[in-house]
Interface confidence: low
């Protein structure tokens, strides 16, 4: 939720990190667009990394990117290829705690 990040300076000493919802598995077709959603909230704002089959996901301009959403992070892959299938994991940390969630794209 947006409110979890919109915290005034008086409350910033209260740190937390929450996985708000597990990641969904995705089934789609070649050439289509897939979106995976990492639903986390925290304070300080969590640093989020995406992994595919345990390797860091590298953004590809105009094809593969991850961006902030009101609920956490969205990984978008355009023009899907067979090589895009695999296990996707998001890992979030606020510097003190770590949470993660895994979904399958196939």
């Amino acid at each position: 939720p947006t409110s979890s990040w919109n915290i005034s300076s008086e409350l910033n000493k209260d740190s937390y990190l929450t996985l708000d919802e597990p990641m969904n598995n995705i089934t789609t077709s070649l050439g289509q667009t897939a979106e995976l959603h990492c639903k986390v909230s925290g304070n300080p704002p969590p640093t989020i990394r995406w992994f595919k089959n345990d390797a860091p996901v590298v953004q590809e301009p105009r094809r593969l990117s991850f961006r902030s959403t009101i609920y956490g992070s969205r990984l978008r892959i355009r023009n899907l290829d067979t090589t895009d299938t695999g296990y996707f994991q998001c890992v979030a940390t606020n510097g003190k705690e770590v949470v993660s969630s895994t979904g399958v794209l196939f």
Partner: antibody
């Protein structure tokens, strides 16, 4: 305490080269990205380049693509900006800034003090 | 590429005034928008990220909002230390663009 310290600025002739350094301390360098942002005298901020030192992904503004190269040495906790074929319009204060990785890669939460690059004959 | 059109380029205001600065994106940029404050001779400071999230340690008189492709920074009650230049910034497809800046001056 998070600190970013730029160095390497100075006076260079058009067509010349310069390498800027950004020494980082107070955080786990490989878990963050580094941006270079410049500001010409009396002008606004212009994003120049970004590196995610974890994956070595690099991105550039069109105005510097092919002339500037951003890199990072995680063993030294330092990012670099190699500037070649410098032009008068590259004259600016160059800042390095830390960003979170991933969907917060644009959020520049700590900045250095800046280093001045002057391109003039 | 996306352009961020920031307005006004400058404004004069008094202590206690409510100040609003707007950035319009040339196309949708999700919520990947930040706002920075810069004082003369100093590096910028982060105020707002994700369009509306207040950065740690920033006074609560600063707030951000989004309506479509319009992003707004509001200072609810201007303080003497708030006279500065403010920049919006967006991220889209690994390009990170700043607005032209808004200079807030003393009336």
């Amino acid at each position: 305490e998070v600190q970013l310290v730029e160095s390497g600025g100075g006076l260079v002739q058009p067509g010349g080269s310069l390498r800027l350094s950004c020494a980082a301390s107070g955080f786990t360098f490989s878990w963050y990205g580094i941006h270079w942002v410049r500001q010409a005298p009396g002008k606004g901020l212009e994003w120049v380049a970004y590196i995610d030192s974890y994956t070595s992904s690099t991105y550039y503004a069109d105005s510097v693509k092919g002339r500037f190269t951003i890199s990072a040495d995680t063993s030294k906790n330092t990012a670099y900006l190699q500037m070649n074929s410098l032009r008068a319009e590259d004259t600016a204060v160059y800042y390095c800034a830390r960003s979170h990785f991933g969907h917060y890669d644009y959020v520049m939460d700590y900045w250095g003090q800046g280093t001045l690059v002057t391109v003039s004959s | 590429d996306i352009q961020m059109t920031q307005s006004p380029s400058s404004l004069s205001a008094s202590v206690g005034d409510r100040v609003t600065i707007t950035c319009r994106a040339s196309q949708s940029v999700s919520s990947a928008v930040a706002w920075y404050q810069q004082k003369p001779g100093k590096a910028p400071k982060l105020l707002i990220y994700s369009a509306s999230s207040l950065y740690s340690g920033v006074p609560s008189r600063f707030s951000g909002s989004r309506s479509g492709t319009d992003f707004t920074l509001t200072i609810s009650s201007l303080q003497p230390e708030d006279f500065a230049t403010y920049y919006c910034q967006q991220a889209y497809d690994q390009l990170y663009t700043f607005g032209q800046g808004t200079k807030v001056e003393i009336k």
